[in-house]
Interface confidence: medium
């Protein structure tokens, strides 16, 4: 080993070196939070870049750059350090059009904390391992969601467009002429029935157990879907989103009530199955895989 390499190894394994890097990263993060940083922070930026460059140089001299098993670039954590340094020099010395976009990569410096703090390294390692292990569960989840999305598509396609429409039309008014002239929500409220405080027209259905319209209104299928058109089973993708919403239980009870009002109470069975399988079983299966991966990483 050359004297330079010996010195580099001594520095690298020293606890003060790790402390210095950790303090630098944390200080750098504090400086990044500044809204309008004063001019002198520019010099501090250069100092940080210098320290990171020194750290990488020490690692390269001690371990070698890329040839060999334990060299600098063979460790994925060092890829992050390398990218941070490359972007630091790029934003500073190379005149690239949209620099603000490149400055975004400064945030990666905060991620350097992970490689320095051992506990964090374990957690992130477990996270990466769990993602690898999750592939099978994810395939199963997507498959299940797809199957139920297709069932939902067949059962509820177009149902959420059902609305309670006013009976008393003027002499020459038709549904089409009305829909063409409706612009504001106030116009809609003239012809469709709205519950107090609701932003969508009252949903209804044509089956005996679906929601009925109040007196003076009949059920028609026209206009857009509820929630600005985002809630529907009209296409596979919208149905898939609705199923994902059920699985994650994201305001799912509203979707449940809307669909049951438009399609009928019988379809409660569909929601029971989806919630049990998707929300209770699959979500817990994902959590179990993550927990297993973390346990393995700890051992």
């Amino acid at each position: 080993f050359s004297p330079l390499r010996r010195i580099s190894i001594k520095i690298l394994v020293h606890s003060l070196f790790s402390m210095l890097i950790m303090c630098t990263i944390l200080t750098n993060c504090i400086f990044m939070t500044m809204n309008n940083p004063p001019d002198w922070t520019k010099n501090v930026e250069y100092t940080f870049t210098g320290i990171y460059t020194f750290e990488s140089l020490v690692k390269i001299l001690a371990r070698g750059f890329c040839v060999g098993e334990f060299t600098f670039l063979r460790d994925p954590w060092n890829w992050l350090d390398f990218v941070v340094i490359v972007f630091a020099y790029l934003t500073e010395f190379v005149n690239l059009g949209n620099v603000s976009a490149l400055r975004t990569f400064r945030v990666l410096r905060a991620l350097k904390t992970i490689s320095v703090i051992p506990g964090l390294k374990t957690i992130v390692g477990a996270l990466i391992q769990s993602v690898k292990k999750l592939s099978d569960v994810m395939i199963l989840t997507v498959f299940c969601l797809s199957v139920f999305a297709l069932i939902g598509l067949q059962l509820f396609m177009g149902n959420l467009k059902h609305k309670c429409f006013r009976n008393s039309l003027e002499n020459n008014e038709t549904l089409e002429s009305i829909m063409n002239t409706l612009e504001s929500e106030e116009d809609f409220r003239k012809y469709f029935y709205y519950l107090e405080g609701s932003k969508d027209a009252l949903l209804c259905g044509f089956s005996t157990d679906s929601g009925q319209c109040p007196e003076g209104y009949t059920c028609v299928k026209i206009g857009r879907n509820p929630d600005y058109g985002y809630t529907s089973f009209d296409t596979f993708s919208w149905a898939f989103l609705a199923l994902f919403r059920l699985m994650t239980q994201d305001y799912w009870e509203n979707l449940y009530q809307q669909t049951l009002r438009a399609a009928g109470k019988t379809y409660m069975i569909f929601f029971v199955v989806v919630i049990f399988l998707g929300s209770f079983y699959l979500i817990n299966l994902i959590l179990a895989v993550v927990a297993m991966a973390y346990e393995e990483q700890n051992q």
Partner: nanobody, 120 residues
Framework: EVQLVESGGGVVQPGGSLRLSCAAS????????MAWYRQAPGKQRELVAY??????ISYADSVKGRFTISRDNSKRVYLQMNSLRPEDTALYYC???????????????WGQGTLVTVSS
């Protein structure tokens, strides 16, 4: 393609009666509301009466007590016209708000019209 076919029109004396019928032909998933309109020569088309699936019925003031609208099944509507007057002379149109199939939106459909002439 869905079509509305009216029948029952003709010439009748004042005070007489007529029964108009309207049937929806073709594929029909759901009929929401059926109505009768009329258009007298040189006048605008006006609503005579309508009936909804829930049984809501409404009549124009000029025909109240004389005309009766009814619906025997989801595809057919009738207009029983009693005590006819000369001013009832018009072309009577059937109109329905219906869905041809479960995937289509509700649309307005008109019949071709049937002529009712009240004269002595």
């Amino acid at each position: 393609e869905v079509q509305l076919v009216e029948s029952g029109g003709g010439v009748v004396q004042p005070g007489g009666s007529l029964r108009l019928s309207c049937a929806a032909s073709g594929p029909v998933f759901n009929i929401n509301r059926m109505a009768w309109y009329r258009q007298a020569p040189g006048k605008q088309r006006e609503l005579v009466a309508y009936v909804t699936p829930t049984g809501d019925i409404s009549y124009a003031d000029s025909v109240k007590g004389r005309f009766t609208i009814s619906r025997d099944n989801s595809k057919r509507v009738y207009l029983q016209m009693n005590s006819l007057r000369p001013e009832d002379t018009a072309l009577y149109y059937c109109r329905a708000l219906l869905q041809p199939d479960s995937y289509s939106n509700t649309r307005t459909y008109w019949g071709q019209g049937t002529l009712v002439t009240v004269s002595s």
